[in-house]
């Protein structure tokens, strides 16, 4: 297996996932496509943790670009050994992957908490409340209770969909970074297999 090619593939995947995370998090600020709730501060507290923008997004771009750079063929080597530089780079990518694990882990945890607590909404008493906070996430299984939120329109569906997307994307990012930790360790210890004779697509 070509460790560099695999790292590059993971890197490209992470860029796409990071951009999707950022988009999903931004959408959480505009329930039903409206700006008024952000300006009135009527959004779930977990939206303000920037889990998708920072954790699953910007923080994920650092390891992503490191992984993409690993496949370049212009490493000059060291100590007379052609692959030494690339092996060092593969090992250093493990550090980048650990940053990615931290970012994606943060994204997953915040998204899970956001799902469990439910949205901030105008409840059936005409009060802005975390209507489903006391249900310990059981509201997710009982859609008949979702009408308890009278405003924003379809806020429960909006929050559940986007936090679920963030949870899934963050989970995939976490797995990919974990794979790169293994890939980086193997690539650093076992050597860099990529050569002009051996090319693999991810």
């Amino acid at each position: 297996m070509c460790y560099g090619k695999c790292a590059r593939c993971i890197g490209h995947s992470l860029v796409g996932l990071a951009l999707l995370c950022i988009a999903a998090n931004i959408l959480l600020y505009f329930p039903n496509g409206e700006t008024k709730y952000a300006s009135e501060n009527h959004l779930s507290r977990f939206v303000w943790f920037f889990s998708g923008i920072v954790g699953g997004g910007l923080l994920m771009l650092l390891p992503a670009f490191v992984f993409i750079g690993l496949e370049q063929d212009d490493c000059c080597g060291c100590c007379g050994h052609e692959n030494c530089g690339k092996r060092c780079a593969m090992l250093s990518s493990v550090l980048a992957a650990l940053i990615g694990i931290a970012g994606s882990g943060y994204c997953v945890i915040v998204a899970a908490l956001g799902l469990a607590e439910g949205p901030l909404c105008l409840d059936s008493l005409g009060q802005w409340n975390y209507t489903f906070a006391s249900t310990e996430g059981q509201y997710l299984l009982d859609t008949s209770t979702w009408s308890e939120c009278t405003e924003p329109k379809h806020i429960v569906e909006w929050n559940v969909s986007l936090f679920s997307i963030l949870l899934a994307l963050g989970g995939i990012e976490f797995i990919l970074c974990l794979i790169q930790v293994i890939n980086g360790v193997l690539g650093g210890i076992c050597g860099f297999c990529c050569s002009h004779q051996q090319q693999y697509d991810c």
């Epitope: 059936s124 008493l125 005409g126 009060q127 802005w128 405003e151 329109k153």
Partner: antibody, heavy 120, light 106 residues
Framework: EVQLVQSGAEVKKPGASVKVSCKAS????????VKWVRQAPGQGLEWMGW????????IYAADFKGRVTMTTDTSTSTAYMELRSLRSDDTAVYYC?????????????WGQGTLVTVSS | EIVLTQSPATLSLSPGERATLSCRAN?????INWYQQKPGQAPRLLIY???NLASGIPARFSGSGSGRDFTLTISSLEPEDFAVYYC?????????FGGGTKVEIK
Amino acid sequence: EVQLVQSGAEVKKPGASVKVSCKASGYTFTNYGVKWVRQAPGQGLEWMGWINTYTGNPIYAADFKGRVTMTTDTSTSTAYMELRSLRSDDTAVYYCVRFQYGDYRYFDVWGQGTLVTVSS
Amino acid sequence: EIVLTQSPATLSLSPGERATLSCRANSGISFINWYQQKPGQAPRLLIYGTANLASGIPARFSGSGSGRDFTLTISSLEPEDFAVYYCQQWSSNPLTFGGGTKVEIK
């Protein structure tokens, strides 16, 4: 001046439906909820439900679920309450009331009331 | 459902006297509102959030209480104060009103 103006008195037969309108003026209609309350002759006040005028989402009191429909027309700043399958004990004055969302949710502006008489 | 019991049902007093109206809930509530209703008229908000005076309401009206027991006090009755008074809660659904206290001229 902030006010709620309701439609005129109605006389209906048992089993029929009645639709009461409530036109708001003097304030931004969608910033407040509209609650409906009724008062039978010589009796106390009974809550029927309320509607979120911004989203159009209604919340009905259990006693009226399935029989009442609350709607709004934001273009005319009007709230409507329709009560179906009328019975003689539905004879009452029906009030629409404005309320502010928040911790206290008080009802500061009341319509003049609409008398609905159900009689065969 | 939270039941509000108002007492007394009728209060007979003279102008200038102090009126104390009681409203008791069958379980703890966070706040109460008070309304005044005169014959042939819609109710009018007097007190909101237990103790806050509504706009345009004279200072002789005051509210107090917490938990299950709430009180509306009219320090010195004026002729226009003779009416029916309702307490109302919305700490939980359904929203409920008390049965009313009629303040009549003695």
